[in-house]
């Protein structure tokens, strides 16, 4: 049920999970100069019942100075198969995340945690993409990727997000940029393409909220 690969990368975009499906593993990694405690867990595991999901095991790091080594803890070879590295995340959550049944929230940081987190995702996991600072969405089709099982193999769907650093792009004559949300898309998805002032104010707020979801999760 583990996904064989990492989610696809999109040029000039980052992704993150808003919640983690039961079965997801998070490696217990320590920052340089620290190591897992002797009897410590190798990973945290998202587990749960029908009403509540939470992370099993706790990651604990201790100073490795006593062993006269500064070797950083890395996953064992068997752990490396489904690794996904993300930047370190803070415990702040989007408000709706905890209510997703069968999913765990972002685990809070542990003392002396490494600066990157390595997740092992499971089938059904969804991750969301957005353009990095300085880039905007030229085209925002489905901006998420789902790990699916097909013909006995796992595969992440390809997000249809194109991020561009080009500020001046053409638009076809006589056509105004969207004023409302066509085809039921959230308004925030049109924010970086809108030219009308009133709507821009709304969408900038929405875009700010959208961005804050990303920035509060990732330090």
């Amino acid at each position: 049920e583990l996904c064989d690969d990492d989610p696809p990368e999109i040029p000039h975009a980052t992704f993150k999970a808003m919640a983690y499906k039961e079965g997801t593993m998070l490696n217990c990694e320590c920052k340089r100069g620290f190591r897992r405690i002797k009897s410590g867990s190798l990973y945290m595991l998202c587990t749960g019942n029908s009403s509540h999901s939470s992370w099993d095991n706790q990651c604990q790091c201790t100073s490795s100075a006593t062993r006269n080594t500064t070797k950083q803890v890395t996953p064992q070879p068997e752990e490396q198969k489904e690794r996904k590295t993300t930047e370190m995340q803070s415990p702040m959550q989007p408000v709706d995340q905890a209510s997703l049944p069968g999913h765990c929230r972002e685990p809070p940081p542990w003392e002396n945690e490494a600066t990157e987190r390595i997740y092992h995702f499971v089938v059904g996991q969804m991750v969301y993409y957005q353009c990095v600072q300085g880039y905007r969405a030229l085209h925002r089709g489905p901006a998420e990727s789902v790990c699916k099982m097909t013909h006995g193999k796992t595969r992440w769907t390809q997000p249809q997000l194109i991020c561009t650093g080009e500020m001046e792009t053409s638009q076809f004559p006589g056509e105004e940029k969207p004023q409302a949300s066509p085809e039921g898309r959230p308004e925030s998805e049109t924010s970086c393409l809108v030219t009308t002032t009133d709507f821009q104010i709304q969408t900038e707020m929405a875009a700010t909220m959208e961005t804050s979801i990303f920035t509060t999760e990732y330090q």
Epitope: P11, H139, R140, G141, Q160, I162, Q171, F172, K177, L193
Partner: antibody
């Protein structure tokens, strides 16, 4: 099933303009950007530009900036490429291709520019 | 603009052979690379995307590898229908440029 169907072959005189179409079916048209690519006889593939089928925003290869115009009509799920001031070097097969990874292509439109 | 250079430009091989085509980018493009197959008079067909992911419906004898600037398309055992021209292309940034193509011919 996913299909991109392009308009028929065109013969044009130098200096004229041309508009070719690419109609998408079998998927949600506005979910995927549309690229335009051309191939001169016996040559390789040349990227012309990409248009967001959702917003109409477009980016062109520098070579085509000002001479090519990509548009979309969401109501008919059709993308268009217009090329003005045609010259003999524009003789080529023009393709539309879907999405980030160009996973589906139109059958191609043969354009001949000749006096 | 990013230049994509394929080698060889043409290649003669026999059915059953293992064939490798390489593509080099003029700068780091991470894994934002596709491989296409084109037969005479037909539109290109996507084989591999994101450097190594096999497109739907493509036989498993095709595989892609590489990251950064150097990429490889491998056909493990050539079939008669594989004789065609192959193109690499990046989608790192606009303009999305293609390699000049590799023509695979029957020996």
């Amino acid at each position: 099933q996913v299909q991109l169907v392009q308009s028929g072959a065109e013969v044009k005189k130098p200096g004229a303009s041309l508009k070719i179409s690419c109609k998408g079916s079998g998927y949600t048209f506005t979910d995927y950007a549309m690229h335009w690519v051309r191939q001169a006889p016996g040559q390789g593939l040349e990227w012309i530009g990409v248009i967001s089928t959702y917003s109409g925003d477009a980016i062109y290869a520098q070579k085509f900036q000002g001479r090519a115009t990509m548009t979309v009509d969401k109501s008919t799920s059709t993308a268009y490429l217009e090329l003005s001031s045609l010259r003999s070097e524009d003789t080529a097969v023009y393709y539309c291709a879907r999405g980030v990874t160009f996973d589906y292509w139109g059958q191609g439109t043969t354009v001949t520019v000749s006096s | 603009d990013i230049q994509m250079t394929q080698s060889p430009s043409s290649l003669s091989a026999s059915v059953g052979d293992r064939v490798t085509i390489t593509c080099r980018a003029s700068q780091d493009i991470s894994n934002y690379l596709e491989w296409y197959q084109q037969k005479p008079g037909k539109a290109p067909k996507l084989l591999i995307y994101n450097a190594k992911t096999l497109a739907e419906g493509v036989p498993s004898r095709f595989s892609g590898s590489g990251s950064g600037t150097d990429f490889t398309l491998t056909i493990s055992s050539l079939q008669p229908e594989d004789f065609a021209t192959y193109y690499c292309q990046h989608h790192y940034d606009t303009p999305y440029t293609f390699g000049q193509g590799t023509k695979l011919e029957i020996k």
